[in-house]
Interface confidence: medium
């Protein structure tokens, strides 16, 4: 579990706004609104990592914090799925996992948390600035996604602490239940923003540390927020991006999947084919300008069933039926 | 407990139109792709429509395309089938299905395939 | 589109039997295969994706096999509750197709 503090952290006002009592007055609504609007939502957070011994290989954490039980969990690069990332690989809690290169293996940390080898070597090795974004279904939460990226003065083998993940999406309404010490403090804040509503609002400096700051671009806005503030993404340095998919389908046109949920993802077909071509449901690459059908290559290394996905302090969980791992 | 439910279905006239729902519950509506598939009396199983979860993206069988409308409401947890100029042929138990994981890469779609399923509910297409 | 082919189109065995069914794509579709079971009156159950994965829950005497254009799906120990019709379903590429079904009988 993380220890970090769940509240941004503020920048005291500039020396002479306000008194010693001003202030507590002022970091408290700050601090209750957060709380007011956090309180019962799950989060993401992110890590990503390069590994010391070598330049091209990362390691990216992510770790749901909730108390639904996830469905699925998708890793990206290049930005959220739906917005130009590329699914790097999908764990399934019951179904295994199935990577795509450059990932070289994807594992289960906790019930809760995955983590995931990165490597390669030339167009389809990871950049330092390449964003990683890792999105959890669970229920009744709903999808929730965040992205980092690895700090930019940060040294080869080290990395940033976890990082909460600003609250990115939530699929289901009625999720924030606010307790009723909350709900109190909610009044509370109300009740202090009239209080001070005709006194002038002294002015803060910029937090360096808030989540809601990103630091180099870490975080990024879900799918859904993208689509709505038309956000543009534009963190992603296109040399790091996989050379299969810049390349060697030149045609690729825009997604039937348009924005990629956590288990569906990019087409490359246009609306304006989908009558006349029929479109491949696994394992293939359409060209939309002559229709014609090239396999996309292998498929995902496949791992043997034997897989525990959830370490278990009592021994290995037995799983129904083989997992079909890729 | 996961579970689908679909209504609407009945004895409707040709060419006439009739919208089928399904209920979803028990699970994360709007993380999953749908289908429908429909069963007519004494033949097998054949695939309708499908739809991404947000529902920007639909595709459907020749047999249906141009009169059927697969569209869903995530808020309600509600999948939907809306048919027009129905056929004598389209009598059918229709069923919704959840698509247990769909992924698609740029180049590749990957069904796992259906592993939810309502009761189903039945239309008759018949003068 | 994907025809897929099963046969038998019904077959009747004892309780305890070896059953197998087999399913045939027109063309190569790997693994992407799944199998159904479809009772009367009820919704459709999976039981077997990928080919040969057992779906959670189902019991061990399923089993399927297969890759390309031909697969095998085998009841090791036929149960009274295993009359059904029995379904395979590519998903190589859409539209999705099923086979046309075995239907399953106890003697």
């Known amino acids: 579990m993380r220890t970090e503090a769940q509240v941004p952290a503020l920048q005291p006002p500039e020396p002479g706004l306000e008194g010693a009592m001003g202030h507590r007055t002022l970091v408290l609504p700050w601090v209750l609104l957060t709380l007011c609007v956090t309180a019962g939502t799950p989060e993401v957070w992110v890590q990503v990592r390069m590994e010391a011994t070598e330049l091209s290989s990362f390691t990216i954490r992510c770790g749901f914090l909730g108390s639904g039980s996830i469905s699925l969990v998708t890793v990206s690069w290049g930005g959220p799925n739906g917005a130009g990332g590329t699914t790097l690989a999908v764990l399934h809690p019951e179904r295994g996992i199935r990577q795509w290169a450059p990932a070289r293996q994807a594992r289960w940390e906790t019930q809760s948390s995955i983590s995931l080898i990165l490597e390669g070597s030339g167009a389809s090795s990871p950049c330092a600035n390449t964003t990683f974004c890792c999105k959890f279904a669970s229920f009744p939460e709903g999808s929730w996604e965040a992205c980092g990226s690895l700090p930019p003065s940060s040294d080869p083998g080290l990395s940033a602490p976890p990082t909460p993940a600003p609250i990115l999406r939530a699929d289901l309404a009625g999720i924030l239940g606010v307790s009723g010490v909350l709900l109190f403090g909610c009044v509370y804040l109300l009740h202090l923003l009239r209080r001070h509503k005709h006194r002038p609002a002294p002015r803060l400096q910029p937090s360096r540390t808030s989540p809601q700051a990103p630091r180099a671009r870490a975080w990024a806005p879900s799918q859904a927020s993208q689509a709505a503030l038309h956000v543009p993404y534009a963190t992603i340095n296109t040399s790091c991006r996989p050379a299969t998919l810049d390349t060697a389908h030149p045609h690729g046109g825009p997604s039937w999947w348009a924005s990629l949920p956590t288990h569906a993802a990019h087409r490359p077909q246009g609306p304006a084919a989908w009558a006349s071509t029929p479109i491949p449901a696994r394992g293939s690459f359409v060209s939309v300008e002559n229709g014609l059908y090239a396999q996309a290559g292998e498929r995902p290394p496949h791992t043997g069933p034997g897989l525990t996905l959830f370490p278990d302090p009592r021994g290995p969980r037995a799983m129904e039926g083989p997992l079909g791992v890729r | 407990e996961v579970q689908l439910v679909e209504t609407g279905g009945g004895l409707i006239q040709p060419g006439r139109s009739l919208r089928l729902s399904c209920a979803a519950s028990g699970f994360t509506f709007s993380s999953y792709a749908m289908h429908w598939v429909r069963q007519a009396p004494g033949k097998g199983l054949e695939w309708v429509a499908v739809i991404s979860y947000d529902g920007s993206n639909k595709y459907y069988a020749d047999s249906v395309k141009g009169r059927f409308t697969i569209s869903r409401d995530n808020s309600k947890n509600t999948l939907y089938l809306q048919m027009n100029s129905l056929r004598a042929e389209d009598t059918a138990v229709y069923y919704c299905?959840?698509?247990?994981?769909?992924?698609?890469?740029?180049?590749?779609?990957?069904?796992?395939?259906?592993?939810?399923w309502g009761q189903g509910t039945t239309v008759t297409v018949s003068s | 589109d994907i025809q897929m082919t099963q046969s038998p189109s019904s077959l009747s065995a004892s309780v305890g039997d070896r059953v197998t069914v087999t399913c045939q794509a027109s063309q190569d579709i790997r693994d992407y295969l799944n199998w159904y079971q479809k009772k009367p009156g009820k919704a459709p159950k999976l039981l077997i994706y990928?080919?040969?994965n057992l779906e959670a829950g189902v019991p061990s005497r399923f089993s399927g096999s297969g890759s390309g254009t031909d697969f095998t799906f085998t009841i090791s120990g036929l149960q009274p509750e295993d009359v059904a019709t029995y379904y395979c379903q590519q998903f190589e590429n859409l539209p999705i197709t099923f086979g046309q079904g075995t239907r399953l009988e106890i003697k």
């Open positions: 990928d080919a040969s």
């Open positions: 299905a959840r698509d247990v994981m769909v992924y698609c890469s740029s180049t590749s779609c990957y069904f796992y395939g259906m592993d939810v």
